[in-house]
C-alpha cells in the first residue's frame, strides 16, 4: 500500500503465500516484504506461552 519496492531479492507479491528465499541469518518479514535479520525463535524455557512448539509445521502466511 504505497511502499516503494527497490530491491528484487527479497520481494514477493502481497498475495503470494510463498516467502522469498533469504540468507541463513535472515527470514522473510511479510510486513515489509523483505528479508530481515532474524533471531532464533524462543524456546519454552525462555518464555513462549504458545502450544505451538518451534519447528511445528506453519503456513508461510502465518508470519507475524
Amino acid at each position: 500500500m504505497g511502499a516503494r519496492r527497490l530491491r528484487v531479492r527479497s520481494q514477493r507479491s502481497r498475495d503470494s503465500s510463498v516467502p522469498t528465499q533469504c540468507n541463513q541469518t535472515e527470514c522473510f518479514d511479510p510486513l515489509v516484504r523483505n528479508c530481515v535479520s532474524c533471531e532464533l525463535f524462543h524456546t519454552p524455557d525462555t518464555g513462549h506461552t504458545s502450544s505451538l512448539e518451534p519447528g511445528t509445521a506453519l503456513q508461510p502466511q502465518e508470519g507475524s
Epitope: R5, R9, P19, D29, H48, G63, S64
Partner: antibody, heavy 125, light 107 residues
C-alpha cells in the same frame, strides 16, 4: 545494549518543516526495519512510517503520505523522518522503534521491541 | 487498511484480579498480532508477539491467544505495576495498525 534516541522535535508553525532523527546503538539498522509511531496528546498510538535500510523500501500512513519522508543512513546508524507541510493534527510525541523478528520456519514472528524515549512535535501558530 | 478494534476501552480492576482484553481485526491477520503496555509519559513496551509468545523478560502472568480475527490478552493476577494502557497491533499487512487502547485502572 540496544538503544534508540530521537531528536529534532520542537515547535513549528503550520506549513513548516522538521527533521526528526533516530540514532541507534547496540545493533545495526541495516538489519531491521525501523518504524516511526506517534501519539497525539491524550490519544492512542498511530503508526507513521517504516523503512528497511538494507532494501530501501518504505511505506507511510495515508495521513502523512506525500508530506513525510522516512530514510536511513546506515553509515551513521540513524533513521530520519522529514516532515513537511506540517499541520496542527501532526502535533504528537514521535517515537522510533525497531521491529524484531524471530525465525518461524523462515518467516518473521515479531514486534517492536525497542523504542526511543520520544520527541515532542508541536505544530501551532 | 486493517482495522483493529479493542474492547473494552477502559476497565477498573483490583490487584489479584484476572483481566481479559480483546482485539478484533477487520480481516484475517493469521497470528500476526503483538500486544504492548504503555504507562503515562513512557514509550510502549512489547509484551506478546505472534499472538501468543511472551517477549523476553515479560512476567508469565501475561498471556496471549487467538488467530485469524479474534485475539485476547490476559493478565492472570493483576499486579500494582500492571495499571497502564494496553494496545494490540497487527503486522500481517502494511500499514501496521494499532487498536485504540484499553486503559486498566485501579478499582
Amino acid at each position: 545494549e540496544v538503544q534508540l534516541v530521537e531528536s529534532g522535535g520542537g515547535l513549528v508553525q503550520p506549513g513548516g518543516s522538521l527533521r526528526l532523527s533516530c540514532a541507534a546503538s547496540g545493533f545495526t539498522i541495516s538489519s531491521n526495519s525501523i518504524h516511526w509511531v506517534r501519539q497525539a496528546p491524550g490519544k492512542g498510538l498511530e503508526w507513521v512510517a517504516w523503512v528497511t535500510p538494507s532494501g530501501g523500501s518504505t511505506d507511510y500512513a495515508d495521513s502523512v503520505k506525500g508530506r513525510f519522508t522516512i530514510s536511513a543512513d546506515t553509515s551513521k546508524n540513524t533513521a530520519y523522518l522529514q516532515m513537511n507541510s506540517l499541520r496542527a493534527e501532526d502535533t504528537a510525541v514521535y517515537y522510533c522503534a525497531r521491529r524484531v523478528c524471530y525465525n518461524r520456519l523462515g518467516v518473521c514472528a515479531g514486534g517492536m521491541d525497542y523504542w526511543g524515549q520520544g520527541t515532542l512535535v508541536t505544530v501551532s501558530s | 487498511d486493517i482495522q483493529m478494534t479493542q474492547s473494552p476501552s477502559s476497565l477498573s480492576a483490583s490487584v489479584g484480579d484476572r483481566v481479559t482484553i480483546t482485539c478484533r481485526a477487520s480481516q484475517d491477520v493469521s497470528t500476526a498480532v503483538a500486544w504492548y503496555q504503555q504507562k503515562p509519559g513512557k514509550a510502549p513496551k512489547l509484551l506478546i508477539y505472534s499472538a501468543s509468545f511472551l517477549y523476553s523478560g515479560v512476567p508469565s502472568r501475561f498471556s496471549g491467544s487467538g488467530s485469524g480475527t479474534d485475539f485476547t490478552l490476559t493478565i492472570s493476577s493483576l499486579q500494582p505495576e500492571d495499571f497502564a494502557t494496553y494496545y494490540c497491533q497487527q503486522s500481517r499487512i502494511s500499514p501496521p495498525t494499532f487498536g485504540q487502547g484499553t486503559k486498566v485502572e485501579i478499582k
